[in-house]
């Protein structure tokens, strides 16, 4: 359970100080220096790719 007053972001998202809202951590693959990426705990999984044609 979250402490009172904490950022209300769900798993896989992180609070953006600049936008004042939660943002999807998946976008940090493309823009890793966005402010909210600091709060993204684990690297999002790479997109699944077939290993054969």
């Amino acid at each position: 359970e979250q402490a009172p007053g904490t950022a209300p972001c769900s798993r896989g998202s992180s609070w953006s100080a600049d936008l004042d809202k939660c943002m999807d951590c998946a976008s940090c693959r493309a823009r890793p220096h966005s402010d909210f990426c600091l709060g993204c705990a684990a690297a999002p999984p790479a997109p699944f790719r077939l290993l054969w044609p």
């Epitope: 979250q2 007053g5 904490t6 950022a7 972001c9 992180s14 609070w15 100080a17 600049d18 004042d20 940090c28 890793p32 220096h33 966005s34 402010d35 990426c37 600091l38 709060g39 993204c40 705990a41 684990a42 690297a43």
Partner: antibody, heavy 120, light 103 residues
Framework: QVQLVQSGGGLVKPGGSLRLSCAAS????????MSWVRQAPGKGLEWVSA????????YYADSVKGRFTISRDNPKNTLYLQMNSLRAEDTAVYYC?????????????WGQGTLVTVSS | LTQSPGTLSLSPGERATLSCRAS?????LTWYQQKPGQAPRLLIY???SRATGIPNRFSGSGSGTDFTLTITRLEPEDFAVYYC?????????FGGGTKVEIT
């Protein structure tokens, strides 16, 4: 208990290099961003750098960009600050700190600090 | 971030009002306390939420560019330096600090 233990400070000549370490214990290291903050003698706090839990996102103050590198070894629960091209104005006590994203990026656990002196 | 006053001289039991002003609008602000020879201690996060273990005589308020830390009745252990901090444009920034000293 939750703690951060720092090492690696000391005396270095201008232009030299130094690596600071911060060993974390008592919490899931990968779940937290980490940061370095410094304090010159008799002065206020100055943020230096921060890194996300995965290590994939790094951030630097303009005053150290291109000279300092923040990194982390998650299996070893350790945060690092590699400092190159050191200047006299980098002389300070350096603190590592745990960043709480859900606390709107407040830093809730701090290391004991380590003194870096840059002097010839 | 500009903190004022630089030094506040008060007596135990008095009320302390510390100001932090940002040059651009800030969504949330953090406050720390630091005593000589010690690491900073998180007091207030998200402008007004007290960190774990912080007594309720400490409170934070404000919005936009003007923020305040209030200590309702100063205890002897509250005499220290207080810093505000923001996170904006992917940069963490501290104010210059306010020293609360015994008059």
């Amino acid at each position: 208990q939750v703690q951060l233990v720092q090492s690696g400070g000391g005396l270095v000549k201008p232009g030299g290099s130094l690596r600071l370490s911060c060993a974390a214990s008592g919490f899931t290291f990968t779940s937290y961003a980490m940061s370095w903050v410094r304090q010159a003698p008799g002065k206020g706090l100055e943020w230096v750098s921060a890194i996300s839990g995965s290590g994939g996102s790094t951030y630097y103050a303009d005053s150290v960009k291109g000279r300092f590198t923040i990194s982390r070894d998650n299996p070893k629960n350790t945060l690092y600050l590699q400092m190159n091209s050191l200047r006299a104005e980098d002389t300070a006590v350096y603190y590592c700190a745990r960043v709480r994203a859900n606390y709107y990026y407040g830093m809730d656990v701090w290391g004991q600090g380590t003194l870096v002196t840059v002097s010839s | 971030l500009t903190q004022s006053p630089g030094t506040l001289s008060l007596s135990p039991g008095e009320r302390a009002t510390l100001s932090c002003r940002a040059s651009q609008s800030v969504s949330r602000l953090t406050w720390y306390q630091q005593k000589p020879g010690q690491a900073p201690r998180l007091l207030i996060y998200g402008t007004s939420s007290r960190a774990t273990g912080i007594p309720n005589r400490f409170s934070g308020s404000g919005s936009g560019t003007d923020f305040t830390l209030t200590i309702t009745r100063l205890e002897p252990e509250d005499f220290a330096v207080y810093y505000c901090q923001q996170f904006r444009n992917s940069l963490l920034t501290f104010g210059g600090g306010t020293k609360v000293e015994i008059t």
